[in-house]
Amino acid sequence: EEAQGDKIIDGAPCARGSHPWQVALLSGNQLHCGGVLVNERWVLTAAHCKMNEYTVHLGSDTLGDRRAQRIKASKSFRHPGYSTQTHVNDLMLVKLNSQARLSSMVKKVRLPSRCEPPGTTCTVSGWGTTTSPDVTFPSDLMCVDVKLISPQDCTKVYKDLLENSMLCAGIPDSKKNACNGDSGGPLVCRGTLQGLVSWGTFPCGQPNDPGVYTQVCKFTKWINDTMKKHR
């Protein structure tokens, strides 16, 4: 198995400070998943990223940066329709134990008011492995540009594994994709959050196997209702 590119998979370091809503969910000091800051008290991530307790890294593109904010979180709320069998509705809200301090490096993500169409160029980011199947974890946040793929085209690859709240993205004949450790992280299109990294084939970065994301535009009501309910 050849090395699969040298970033996220086949990406590059993000422009510094360009993803101020990006967070890392840590288990102790170890990367567990990505996520996004929705507001001062809430992080959105994938339901399959659930743990008993989280340490949330915010405010720096570099894991281990002493200037970063690190906030504990012990409450998380999975979407009630999440299935550990089909992985449908793969999203979860994590409530921070204390408020995040907003700054130029810590900002709220913009939730979508509409679903972006196939062909839209988007950016997926994370601190996940840059090689697969052998892992190489970067300390700096990585980015890669991908395009939204229509459900019809994605179903040709994944058949009935694809549910209607799943979103596919990739570049034909390219390795560009997310991988282990990127789960729950953002797919941002035209400045709004359209996807959360959910799953894909393995090893990561197989050409013509798109990444699969939770389609956030289908869940804005649940996100807002859940944050309100658990204020």
């Epitope: 288990s27 170890q30 567990h32 994938a46 339901a47 399959h48 990223c49 659930k50 743990m51 550990t84 069998q85 992985h87 793969d90 996940g128 697969s132 199947p133 994944y158 058949k159 594994l161 997310a178 991988c179 282990n180 450790g181 990127d182 789960s183 990294v197 959910s198 799953w199 894909g200 084939t201 393995f202 990561c204 699969v212």
Partner: antibody
């Protein structure tokens, strides 16, 4: 070294319970799922169920539902499989296996424990 | 549940022979099929994943093909260390993960 090391052989009486352990080393235990597969003497492989090391989510084979419990201890990177109300046809080698994949979905077993022989006999 | 049917259940072959084992799924599993080798008293070992991708460290005489419902494992030139039992499994529609019944490759 990346490996799964299982506990030793067990002999149990019908109606008893057995708990088999599987200790992971050389990789981040919480990033992967652990599955249990058994093999009766001279027979094929039978999937028993799986557990996510981080979330504790479990999926069990229908025929074992109610008799099997899978757990993990992340502080020691150990997975456990307990089987209750043992019968003679539970006599088998029990394997733990790591499923490879990324995100919510996994695709194949890339690492196996050495197996634990469980004999159920009166 | 998806049923996996392997054939033959056993075969006799000589060193240097080309050996073919088939696995049939009861419904389409795309290319999400894997092959494992198991020797007596040992745990299974992954040979092929995703129907045709060779696992790292596995000799190139092993190859896999197929998609949908019909899959094949081929050993191009059987070596003494290849005498073992071979299993397929599917990770497409899970749970449960289902295995084929196994094919025992014996010395002629």
């Amino acid at each position: 070294q990346v490996q799964l090391v299982q506990s030793g052989a067990e002999v149990k009486k019908p109606g008893a319970s057995v708990k088999v352990s599987c200790k992971a080393s050389g990789y981040t235990f919480t990033s992967e799922g652990i599955h249990w597969v058994r093999q009766a003497p001279g027979q094929g492989l039978e999937w028993m169920g799986s557990i996510s090391a981080s979330s504790g989510d479990t999926n069990y084979a229908q025929k074992l539902q109610g008799r099997v419990t899978m757990t993990t201890d992340t502080s020691t990177s150990t997975a456990y499989m307990e089987l209750r109300s043992l019968r003679s046809d539970d006599t088998a080698v029990y394997y733990c296996a790591r499923a490879a994949g990324y995100g919510a979905r996994h695709w194949y077993f890339d690492l196996w424990g050495q197996g634990t022989m469980v004999t159920v006999s009166s | 549940d998806i049923q996996m049917t392997q054939s033959p259940s056993s075969l006799s072959a000589s060193v240097g022979d080309r050996v073919t084992i088939t696995c049939r799924a009861s419904q389409s599993i795309s290319s999400y099929l894997n092959w494992y080798q198991q020797k007596p008293g040992k745990a299974p070992k992954l040979l092929i994943y995703g129907a045709s991708s060779l696992q790292s460290g596995v000799p190139s005489r092993f190859s896999g093909s197929g998609s949908g419902t019909d899959f094949t494992l081929t050993i191009s030139s059987l070596q003494p260390e290849d005498f073992a039992t071979y299993y397929c499994d599917q990770f497409y529609s899970t749970p449960p993960i289902t295995f084929g019944g196994g094919t025992k490759v014996e010395i002629k």
